[in-house]
């Protein structure tokens, strides 16, 4: 992967009102199941079509839940995070960090006709062009000198 | 209303083959991690395989090799395709989803599922 990839880290409030089949979305993570290395934290990975979380629209694939009605979720087993949200009750407040990538450099591969991802044969080869053309001009101005 | 039904049971004998399935009804299957388990008589209910919303799989050692769990997301159905059945297979077979959990382990290794079917038998003599 060529170039760095940071984050820019928000967090917010999301109060969900219980479906017929929970809160709309899957969790992974735990101290027994860590999604993210170093990192025991309770991800979301599933927003189910048409759950709560789905109509409400602001949770995202890829969120870390910190808390569940005030409840910390650091240092939990998968099971027992699990069972916090299988008890939380009919509404629901969670408190989420959302991660949106920014891109520093060229990362991996982009489509053809991104105008952010630009070759970079096509910015260094100008340039070395440029460079040629003023150093010769350069020489060419100290012979006449 | 979610609703989960189990077929395909019944009597085989030992080195035969059986598949069940189970058809899901109320919700779509492939948002949910769910898994096969069984209960023989006198015995606690253990997980048997299990399969995440993202497709990853788990299976319990004693069906290691034997078993296969899959999904149909057209047909919404999940399914245990069982070979080289031994007669210690004999159990009540349930499907169960939870609602939260994502990790195929996990709900292999837990009882606190949110969603159960009612079973079929599964005989190994």
């Known amino acids: 992967m060529n170039g760095r990839v940071d984050y820019l880290v928000t967090e917010e409030e999301i109060n969900l009102t219980r479906g017929p089949s929970g809160l709309g979305f899957n969790i992974v993570g735990g101290t027994d199941q860590q999604y993210v290395s170093n990192d025991s934290g309770i991800y979301v990975s599933r927003i189910k079509e048409n759950g709560a979380a789905a109509l409400d629209g602001r949770l995202q694939e890829g969120d870390k839940i910190l808390s569940v009605n005030g409840q910390d979720l650091k240092n939990l087993l998968h099971q027992d995070a699990v069972d916090l949200f299988r008890n939380a009750g009919y509404a629901v407040s969670l408190r989420v960090q959302h991660r949106l990538q920014v891109q520093n450099g060229p990362i991996g591969h982009r489509g053809e006709g991104d105008p952010s991802g630009i070759p970079i044969f096509m910015v260094l080869v100008p340039v070395f062009a440029l460079t040629m053309v003023a150093a010769w001009a350069f020489m060419r101005y100290r012979q006449q000198l | 209303q979610v609703q989960l039904v189990e077929s395909g049971g019944g009597l085989v004998q030992p080195g035969g083959s059986l598949r069940l399935s189970c058809a899901a009804s109320?919700?779509?299957?492939?948002?949910?991690?769910i898994g096969w388990f069984r209960q023989a008589p006198g015995k606690e209910r253990e997980g048997v395989s299990c399969?995440?919303?993202?497709?990853?799989?788990y299976y319990a050692d004693s069906v290691k090799g034997r078993f296969t769990i899959s999904r149909d997301n057209v047909k919404n159905t999940l399914y245990l395709q069982m070979n080289s059945l031994k007669p210690e297979d004999t159990a009540l077979y349930y499907c169960?989803?939870?609602?939260?959990?994502?990790?195929?382990?996990?709900?292999?290794?837990?009882?606190?599922?949110?969603?159960w079917g009612q079973g079929t038998q599964v005989t190994v003599s």
């Open positions: 169960a989803a939870s609602y939260y959990s994502d990790y195929e382990v996990a709900v292999c290794r837990s009882d606190a599922l949110d969603a």
């Open positions: 109320g919700f779509t299957l492939d948002d949910y991690a």
């Open positions: 399969i995440s919303s993202h497709g990853s799989t």
